[in-house]
């Protein structure tokens, strides 16, 4: 439906709120080096105009696009060439290309200060000082850092932030009360930052046709009972809403966002059971909750999926005549019994499936030729449920902290060129797989462990991409969009690769490492591991494991010492002169 | 399992020296650091050195340091301890140890597996 105004009827849509948060979102995401306060007088400038465009909808420039109307506005910033050097560039272009030119200059990971939380009786001044500043703050420091968030979830983040400082700046304890509850909202924030990411690479680097296989997975498991067509319907507008969102036409993505959950609760009787409780929420509420709503029972005595996919003489008709819907039918049809598994397996089975139509199709006897097609799928199903029975035994035995280690240790002799702070970040986020994941019973292990892996490996593939080092991370990340965590679990140790040069000024450590929180300190240690196995990556896990306790014992006791700085520079040496003895560095 | 068995541990005066012994079997003993800890009557068991997997890394409590020497030779998997110019004070069980996979390298949480323990009295 054409609006005479889109400007105008996104503000009436969303309403001001949302819609001057939205704005805000958007240009942070776009220049995520610009100051606080000029963004705040960009998004007052563009609502002062929509207001004009609700007004009179044929008031001048009100009939432009929303790309047309936010990319002047962006293009209108003085230092955009000082800030932000080439991106300056894209103000010569002309829609779409400028939007284009724009989203290829997001950065997954820009150069800004990390964000050191101030003392609750600070943050709670200033939160009742001026609670519409400290919110949209809130809004701006977050996308900046994220420009891939998944902009009307955050509106949902907000509130939740709101409503935690609105209770705990009241409470006795406001630290007991506030800093639990903001740990969650930064680990849950996070986790969506690298879920949305994922959705958002698939969408551009694989295309609308592997989103919506991975949506017709996800939303089948999800809604056993939903007929095909209605998965169809729910996958389509799904898709449009993520592509909205990725592309950062962000007033149209939650508009549409606040459609689809509209549309799925009136029709939750041919959807999901589960789906009651969501729909008595608020609308941000509402949405998130549908996201996260659990899988509904499976209908009883589903048929075998052999009588029509393998069986039947009319699979290569079938296929022939409509080849992504027979597909995708397929697809909907074994996601729905099969909750058990991970969206990825379902779409490498579904991926073996077209495969073996293509071929044999073509051949002279077709069914003679796919009826073993289901016998191809077992080595495919094997190879994650003992790849997680292995690494949940590992982790057991380890606990997270070591678990991680391990995976250091081994991503680092696979891909040692990637940069130590993406290796230590990116096995870190991998080593929570354990906690994550194992603690579940075996029929949910897998979905919970490889969708999760997925994620995090799409979070190594879009930091190597702004600086590529490694062909092997690039193929992996490049060649299937499924397959990646197969592909990295398939490399081995890369011989190719040159130790690092011995460089005495990486394991120096000072005094600082003692007020560090525990997380941080182990990141420390987990930084020096990734060096240590730079330097040399042909030490054995036991070596490997003897220096880390030399070292976990150095800091101990520099950290007990009198004068503390004095013992680092000491004992720091003998021990890089000892590890270096023992490994030949 | 492990099995570490201390030696060396006797009476004697003070000023002198003794030298202790422990001899490991069992798991890897090359790939661990090993402590030396000792318990005197009514007191709770205290750190005294430890030397690293390789035997080129020592830390020592400061009550024994400049005094005692910690070394290894991981061919014969022994560990053993100089202790020189003794005193009365020194008078305890010493125990060797294997380091375990977590906890504190100077707390006997820290460690795994322990010797029987070997008696040193220095008579004043």
């Known amino acids: 439906d054409a609006h005479k105004s889109e400007v105008a009827h996104r503000f009436k849509d969303l309403g001001e709120e949302n819609f001057k948060a939205l704005v805000l979102i958007a240009f942070a995401q776009y220049l995520q080096q610009c100051p606080f306060e000029d963004h705040v007088k960009l998004v007052n400038e563009v609502t002062e105009f929509a207001k004009t465009c609700v007004a009179d909808e044929s008031a001048e420039n009100c009939d432009k696009s929303l790309h047309t109307l936010f990319g002047d506005k962006l293009c209108t910033v003085a230092t955009l060439r000082e800030t932000y050097g080439e991106m300056a560039d894209c103000c010569a272009k002309q829609e779409p290309e400028r939007n284009e030119c724009f989203l290829q200059h997001k950065d997954d990971n820009p150069n800004l200060p990390r964000l050191v939380r101030p003392e609750v009786d600070v943050m709670c001044t200033a939160f009742h000082d001026n609670e519409e500043t400290f919110l949209k703050k809130y809004l701006y420091e977050i996308a900046r850092r994220h420009p891939y968030f998944y902009a009307p979830e955050l509106l949902f983040f907000a509130k939740r932030y709101k409503a935690a400082f609105t209770e705990c700046c009241q409470a006795a304890d406001k630290a007991a009360c506030l800093l639990p509850k903001l740990d969650e909202l930064r680990d849950e924030g996070k986790a969506s930052s690298a879920k949305q990411r994922l959705k958002c690479a698939s969408l551009q680097k694989f295309g609308e046709r592997a989103f919506k296989a991975w949506a017709v997975a996800r939303l089948s498991q999800r809604f056993p009972k939903a007929e095909f067509a209605e998965v169809s319907k729910l996958v389509t507008d799904l898709t449009k809403v993520h592509t909205e969102c990725c592309h950062g036409d962000l007033l149209e993505c939650a508009d549409d966002r606040a459609d689809l959950a509209k549309y799925i609760c009136e029709n939750q009787d041919s959807i999901s059971s589960k789906l009651k409780e969501c729909c008595e929420k608020p609308l941000l509420e509402k949405s998130h909750c549908i996201a996260e709503v659990e899988n509904d029972e499976m209908p009883a005595d589903l048929p075998s999926l052999a009588a029509d996919f393998v069986e039947s003489k009319d699979v290569c008709k079938n296929y022939a005549e409509a080849k992504d819907v027979f597909l995708g039918m397929f697809l909907y049809e074994y996601a729905r019994r099969h909750p058990d598994y991970s969206v990825v397996l379902l779409l490498r089975l579904a991926k073996t499936y077209e495969t073996t139509l293509e071929k044999c199709c073509a051949a002279a006897d077709p069914h003679e030729c796919y009826a073993k097609v289901f016998d191809e799928f077992k080595p495919l199903v094997e190879e994650p449920q003992n790849l997680i029975k292995q690494n949940c035994e590992l982790f057991e035995q380890l606990g997270e902290y070591k678990f991680q280690n391990a995976l250091l240790v081994r991503y680092t002799k696979k891909v040692p060129q990637v940069s130590t702070p993406t290796l230590v970040e990116v096995s870190r986020n991998l080593g929570k797989v354990g906690s994550k994941c194992c603690k579940h019973p075996e029929a949910k292990r897998m979905p919970c462990a490889e969708d999760y892996l997925s994620v995090v490996l799409n979070q190594l593939c879009v930091l190597h991409e702004k600086t590529p080092v490694s062909d092997r991370v690039t193929k992996c990340c490049t060649e299937s969009l499924v397959n990646r965590r197969p592909c990295f679990s398939a490399l081995e140790v890369d011989e190719t690769y040159v130790p690092k040069e011995f460089n005495a000024e990486t394991f120096t450590f000072h005094a600082d490492i003692c007020t560090l929180s525990e997380k941080e300190r182990q990141i420390k240690k987990q930084t020096a591991l990734v060096e240590l196995v730079k330097h040399k990556p042909k030490a054995t896990k036991e070596q490997l494991k003897a220096v880390m306790d030399d070292f976990a014992a150095f800091v101990e006791k520099c950290c007990k010492a009198d004068d503390k700085e004095t013992c680092f520079a000491e004992e720091g040496k003998k021990l890089v002169a000892a590890s270096q003895a023992a490994l030949g560095l | 399992q492990v099995q570490l068995v201390e030696s060396g541990g006797g009476l004697v005066q003070a000023g002198d020296s003794l030298r202790l012994s422990c001899a490991a079997s069992?798991?890897?003993?090359?790939?661990?650091?090993m402590g030396w800890f000792r318990q005197a009557p009514g007191k709770e068991r205290e750190f005294v050195a430890r030397?690293?997997?390789?035997?080129?890394?020592?830390y020592y409590a400061d009550s024994v340091k400049g005094r005692f020497t910690a070394s290894r030779d991981n061919a014969k998997n022994t560990v053993y301890l100089q202790m020189n110019s003794l005193k009365p004070e020194d008078t305890a069980v010493y125990y060797c140890?294997?380091?375990?996979?977590?906890?504190?390298?100077?707390?006997?949480?820290?460690?795994?597996?322990w010797g029987q323990g070997t008696q040193v009295t220095v008579s004043s």
């Open positions: 140890a294997q380091r375990g996979d977590s906890g504190s390298n100077y707390d006997p949480s820290g460690y795994s597996y």
């Open positions: 069992g798991r890897t003993f090359s790939g661990y650091a």
């Open positions: 030397i690293n997997w390789s035997g080129t890394l020592t």
